[in-house]
Amino acid sequence: FKVTTPYSLYVCPEGQNATLTCRILGPVSKGHDVTIYKTWYLSSRGEVQMCKEHRPIRNFTLQHLQHHGSHLKANASHDQPQKHGLELASDHHGNFSITLRNVTPRDSGLYCCLVIELKNHHPEQRFYGSMELQVQAGKGSGSTCMASNEQDSDSITAA
């Protein structure tokens, strides 16, 4: 499989909710010994490869922002990200998202989704997607977020 980002750029007025989405495309290994681990973090546009830097999203690091798979227990502090305006969602079609509520210009940056395929006695397979969030200060609350493709946004796969 691979990870794609339906939109590579989100432009949101301050105060709106921004939902950033990644999508797993293609067949995902099934079976008791396979876990798909999905998480989110902030990064920067590195010279060699994007998504190499790991920065927290509203002080939550990548292990706090997991979409819990079949083997991964829900976080004991699972509701804490919600208290800080962060919500995780996923469906059975491979889509998964993070919603940032009431965005401010400080939320602007490069967001990365990371999908890891875990198989027993196998190395991790890592897949990345990235998208830019630009929050415009002082825009009216009536306007909504705009999502667009500024370039071909298929992610690079790194094992």
Epitope: D33, T35, K52, H71, L72, K73, A74, N75, N120, P123
Partner: antibody
């Protein structure tokens, strides 16, 4: 605050087995790998392998496959490493460390010294 | 297995000096390497990840660079508390392996 608390030093006889523990606090135990690393004086750091608690996924360094066995108990948030058929070559400090999937060894335990002597 | 080679086992430096430690991978590891600091009697601590990014709370005198097979760890102005052994480690594919370590002595 994320911490890994390791069990105390062990003095063992050759041929015996020892079980070292590593108790995690401050995060969801099942969300990160527990790594095991060996350090002998003058030998630097050697990776023995890893376990993902809750799933019991393991990856072993081939060199230590017949020496080390990893287990984890999610009810007590504790990972264990058993070393069997001990020899003087197994005398070392053993560290556990946490690794979020896809990332690096970001938190380390204080280490457990194992001495094998007759 | 990927072999990580730190060519200098020991380096001697003075407070205020700039010092660079090198690490060479036996095959291309992209930027999937980390640098750890181990002070005497302590466990290792993560300083640099993904070749060039400082871990949380790490002073900005510590920097990392490189990609592929050649990596450098630099302390721009050595402090007395930087006396330690520094290890590189790749995380490209298992087994993860460490360099042999470089012991930094302060004159």
């Amino acid at each position: 605050q994320v911490q890994l608390q390791q069990s105390g030093a062990e003095l063992m006889k050759p041929g015996a087995s020892v079980k070292i523990s590593c108790t995690a606090t401050g995060y969801t135990f099942s969300s990160c790998w527990i790594e095991w690393v060996k350090q002998r004086p003058g030998h630097g750091l050697e990776w023995l392998g890893e376990i993902l608690p809750g799933s019991d996924y393991t990856n072993y360094n081939e060199k230590f496959k017949d020496k080390a066995t990893f287990t984890a108990d999610t009810s007590s948030d504790t990972a264990y490493m058993q070393l069997s058929s001990l020899t003087s070559e197994d005398s070392a400090v053993y560290y556990c460390a946490r690794r979020p999937p896809g990332w690096y060894f970001d938190v380390w335990g204080a280490g457990t010294a194992v001495t094998v002597s007759s | 297995d990927i072999v990580m080679t730190q060519s200098h086992k020991f380096m001697s430096t003075s407070v205020g000096d700039r010092v660079s430690i090198t690490c060479k991978a036996s095959q291309d590891v992209s930027t999937d390497i980390a640098w750890y600091q181990q002070k005497p009697g302590q466990s290792p601590k993560l300083l640099i990840y993904s070749a060039s990014y400082r871990f949380t709370g790490v002073p900005d005198r510590f920097t990392g660079s490189g990609s592929g097979t050649d990596f450098t760890f630099t302390i721009s102005s050595v402090q007395a508390e930087d006396l330690a052994v520094y290890y590189c480690q790749h995380q490209y594919s298992t087994p993860w392996t460490f360099g042999g370590g470089t012991k930094l002595d302060i004159k």
